[in-house]
Amino acid sequence: ECGHISVSAPIVHLGDPITASCIIKQNCSHLDPEPQILWRLGAELQPGGRQQRLSDGTQESIITLPHLNHTQAFLSCCLNWGNSLQILDQVELRAGYPPAIPHNLSCLMNLTTSSLICQWEPGPETHLPTSFTLKSFKSRGNCQTQGDSILDCVPKDGQSHCCIPRKHLLLYQNMGIWVQAENALGTSMSPQLCLDPMDVVKLEPPMLRTMDPSPEAAPPQAGCLQLCWEPWQPGLHINQKCELRHKPQRGEASWALVGPLPLEALQYELCGLLPATAYTLQIRCIRWPLPGHWSDWSPSLELRTTERAPTVRLDTWWRQRQLDPRTVQLFWKPVPLEEDSGRIQGYVVSWRPSGQAGAILPLCNTTELSCTFHLPSEAQEVALVAYNSAGTSRPTPVVFSESRGPALTRLHAMARDPHSLWVGWEPPNPWPQGYVIEWGLGPPSASNSNKTWRMEQNGRATGFLLKENIRPFQLYEIIVTPLYQDTMGPSQHVYAYSQEMAPSHAPELHLKHIGKTWAQLEWVPEPPELGKSPLTHYTIFWTNAQNQSFSAILNASSRGFVLHGLEPASLYHIHLMAASQAGATNSTVLTLMTLTPEGSELH
């Protein structure tokens, strides 16, 4: 070996200076008598080496690197050898920081593994090999006096946690625990924890299960769930409090928390939930009232709440067939009585014959909002219910009675906008209990089965806005029937449009007679069309060759018109505009030429 490097310290604080010397022995005879020693840090040549010849003939170069800013680098001592650099010796330099104080030390007692697991945050990177050791001792008091030391716990490389096994633990007694961090630049220690391992016990959650239905037990109420849990075996005798959380599986609802529940409740009825809804449930527990840590949430249990019987009011209306008055068409509408009124699976219309106690005869069972059935001759009333798997709504009686009540008067209708009609009336005396308003297409498209209807519960109402199934340019028949205690009044009807259409085209103009200064025109009026409002007037327009325009307004019954004051031998463009309240339409243009002064009149 020709050269040897020695350094002031191979490991320094990052950014600190470092001094190195390189000595070349004299007996390296193949070298120049006065060789020039060069320094290289990594791949870069470093200036500043001070070289001298020592008394024993060896050459020495000393260099000071003012700041070592590499966390790891090789420092080489070299000579120029021909055209290349010859490395005589090199050393590895390292730079970094002493370990920061480990922080956030915390421990959990795991009863499954019977060990105390402690974890910490090591702090910023030191750039140097740093070892962590979990140190602990047993203590009788509050860790002021140190008892027996416990074997150091050394984590696996790169881990910031360590397990103290059961054989080194003393439960129900305090232990002093801290973390020591050490590297070449120093040692640091975390603040000491003083704890009884049982006070940091982290339990496992119970296992949630659905309760097996027992024949004698009542089924859960609507919006309720019956569940039970199996305690975690190692925590059987530990006092705990638990909490449940639940949320509907569908939608974005957040978890709702229920608790505290004693662990030993073991079974629980959870109510106040939405009926007929799938829920996700979880449970967790904590040692209580003694200290401890919350368990993780248990695996989810998914359960569905039972549904509730429909809570609806059924508004009803009926019609008899004209040809067969015993055939009744019954209509109904469910009106929710609560925000969650229960799912409706279907409807049943039934009749209870008098004298047959308990006998109920179903007349129809349907999922529709109407049904047609034959009314037994002695039947004056039927009952209608909505049902689902949980039961039925309160029965709605439907009484079939003659129209004996007074009629309403002055029934009228007017358009509000293209999709709504206002129907108004004068209430009869006495006030009815309410009204049924029916509407549907008028002739020629009229159909009893396609009518829409609404119940107006306010007997003092003097009108109703029809917003359902109203389209512009259609004629509607609106029928209003007053309802009384045990009867109804006669139905009244009125026809109306929500929006009428402008005439689709104006009549074609025809020239009947022409002269030098006049022209007689005629036209055949368009036949009236349903959905189109009647004509209010015509306007006739004529324009001469000089682009001067003239017009005249004619009433809707006009069939012709004579233009006077025309210029002889002149060209005119004429068109007719047919107008109604809904708009106007122009005819095609008729072009004509008046006769020359010497010409004879044409008739």
């Epitope: 019977s114 059961r166 075996q233 190692p234 006092n239 030993e264 409740a265 009232p289 003694l290």
Partner: antibody, heavy 118, light 107 residues
């Protein structure tokens, strides 16, 4: 002083009933499971029953199930064992004991002798 | 139900001897094993809980080990006051159960 004192033992005929009591003092009774352990003359220890801190969970040994009932009154710091349909084989010293969180009996009463004989 | 089997049922030993008693569970019970000492006419006394934890006031010559199904109570140097019957007990299940006992007598 932390202690448990049993009472209520004595001589009873087969088929008869007896109620044992155990008065606790010196610790927070309502926080702990409690239990009864018995020892027949010259025999080993036999677990009879336990009761959770609020009384909601009450496991029993098969040999006494349906005949014995364990209960507690946390307001009186007292544990009970109601013994019905007693048999000769129920003759034993009955110990009341406090259960620690890990299921160990860390405090015992002095025991009360129950003799079932005609 | 969990059965506990203790062995030997009795043993003779001299003061200063090292004594080992074993207890086997019919199924795994983790570390939920406790040891008791009972002297004639007295209530049992807790020695070791959770397999290896020494109860307060119990001399350090008593130690426990094991987990799962096999457990051991060791008295490192038998003292005159240690002649008694020793019981193991599992606390893994609601149904607690004891071993049959080991009587330690003077040789």
């Amino acid at each position: 002083e932390v202690q448990l004192l049993e009472s209520g033992g004595g001589l009873v005929q087969p088929g008869g009933s007896l109620r044992l009591s155990c008065a606790a003092s010196g610790f927070t009774f309502s926080l702990y499971w409690m239990g009864w352990v018995r020892q027949a003359p010259g025999k080993g220890l036999e677990w009879v029953s336990s009761i959770s801190s609020s009384g909601g969970v009450t496991p029993y040994a098969d040999s006494v199930k349906g005949r014995f009932t364990i209960s507690r009154d946390n307001s009186k710091n007292t544990l009970y064992l109601q013994m019905n349909s007693l048999r000769a084989e129920d003759t034993a010293v009955y110990y009341c004991a406090k259960l620690g969180e890990l299921g160990m009996y860390d405090l015992w009463g002095q025991g009360t002798l129950v003799t079932v004989s005609s | 139900d969990i059965q506990m089997t203790q062995s030997p049922s009795s043993l003779s030993a001299s003061v200063g001897d090292r004594v080992t008693i074993t207890c086997r569970a019919s199924q795994g019970i983790s570390s939920y094993l406790n040891w008791y000492q009972q002297k004639p006419g007295k209530a049992p006394k807790l020695l070791i809980y959770y397999a290896s934890n020494l109860q307060n006031g119990v001399p350090s010559r008593f130690s426990g080990s094991g987990s799962g199904t096999d457990f051991t109570l060791t008295i490192s140097s038998l003292q005159p006051e240690d002649f008694a019957t020793y019981y193991c007990q599992q606390s893994w299940a609601y149904g607690l159960s004891f071993g049959g006992g080991t009587k330690v007598e003077i040789k």
